[in-house]
Amino acid sequence: PEPPTACREKQYLINSQCCSLCQPGQKLVSDCTEFTETECLPCGESEFLDTWNRETHCHQHKYCDPNLGLRVQQKGTSETDTICTCEEGWHCTSEACESCVLHRSCSPGFGVKQIATGVSDTICEPCPVGFFSNVSSAFEKCHPWTSCETKDLVVQQAGTNKTDVVCGPQDRLRA
């Protein structure tokens, strides 16, 4: 029969024959022969291969360097890489999470729309009318102005996006 020019999924062409790829978690040792299947070996400790492959070397698991603020979120296996995340108060600088930076704080006049995670930074939003933030914080949302009316008080000083309203007693009508 004619030697194949293409092979099925999970196979590769070598020496005019189709050989099985090594399964995830294993590397290629020797191509298949006319008598035997492909020879593969498991990846070593701290190594992985995540696809059907003909790789001669397994990949090293990612190292979550604590000096860069990283910690292990999910330990790698022979078939998966280690997933790093950042220490509390820090977040990844990229999708690959190779280093971390401190969560940003929202300045006065801005509140936290979304609290930061290990992989995303704080999202701030300007405090709309009726709300304020007088602190720089990575957690505080914009607070609503105090309602003077509900306390039987009146507004003595209008609020801003950075300050609350100041309430005071109502003026009494003289007899």
């Epitope: 040792v29 020797s30 191509d31 022969t33 498991p42």
Partner: antibody, heavy 116, light 110 residues
């Protein structure tokens, strides 16, 4: 067709050296681990060493560590075994074999005799 | 790195079945399914008969079969024939990334 042809064997005195070669053909040499296996006269098989595709991984049986060195030249489709500090107990037929831990193909062997 | 343990000799009559055992440790036979069996006729190079515990290379008679339980692998030859008379060796990959062979078993067909 796969062919493995060993050469370089011979008579050598204890403490001497030899370099064995294995010329490979009929397959993609550079994508296969290769091994050396020996057999003393009238005795069983003994695995000696193996080497991965690019030569970055090499493994040896304890009894030859520090004395034998396995290497390869993918451009020449050749496998080598450098034998130093030879002892009488190294006397054997030395076979090269294709693969890392299972061997469908063997050479015809080259005889190493260590004797004074 | 001591050799895997095989019986020195086994014999059987034509048509019978025989089993050759190969005992290792949890660092070799028991660690992986990377056990092979070789047949060696006098003056010849070894021939692969079984690989990865149970797989038979194409061209090898289906009278040859392999199995493993714990740290012991076995080669069974059924319907014994005169041409099966030979030495048989097991080999196993180890956790040290090395290979280890058994001492060999001489099979005699009576």
């Amino acid at each position: 067709e796969v062919h493995l042809v060993e050469s370089g064997g011979g008579l050598v005195q204890p403490g001497g050296s030899l370099r064995l070669s294995c010329a490979a053909s009929g397959f993609t040499f550079s994508s296969n681990w290769m091994s050396w296996v020996r057999q003393a006269p009238g005795k069983g098989l003994e695995w000696v060493a193996n080497i991965n595709q690019d030569g970055s991984e090499k493994y040896y049986v304890d009894s030859v560590k520090g004395r034998f060195t396995i290497s390869r030249d993918n451009a020449k489709n050749s496998l080598y075994l450098q034998l130093n500090s030879l002892r009488a107990e190294d006397t054997a037929e030395y076979y090269c074999a294709r693969g890392g831990y299972r061997y469908a193909y063997w050479g015809q062997g080259t005889l190493v005799t260590v004797s004074s | 790195q001591s050799a895997l343990t095989q019986p020195a000799s086994v014999s059987g009559s034509p048509g019978q079945s025989i089993t050759i055992s190969c005992t290792g440790t949890s660092s070799d036979v028991g660690a992986y399914n990377y056990v092979s069996w070789y047949q060696q006729l006098p003056g010849k190079t070894p021939k692969l008969m079984i690989y990865d515990v149970t797989n038979r290379p194409s061209g090898v008679s289906n009278r040859f079969s392999g199995s493993k339980s714990g740290n012991t692998a076995s080669l069974t030859i059924s319907g014994l024939q005169a041409e099966d008379e030979a030495y048989y060796y097991c080999g196993s990959y180890t956790t040290s990334s090395t290979l280890i062979f058994g001492g060999g078993t001489e099979l005699t067909v009576l």
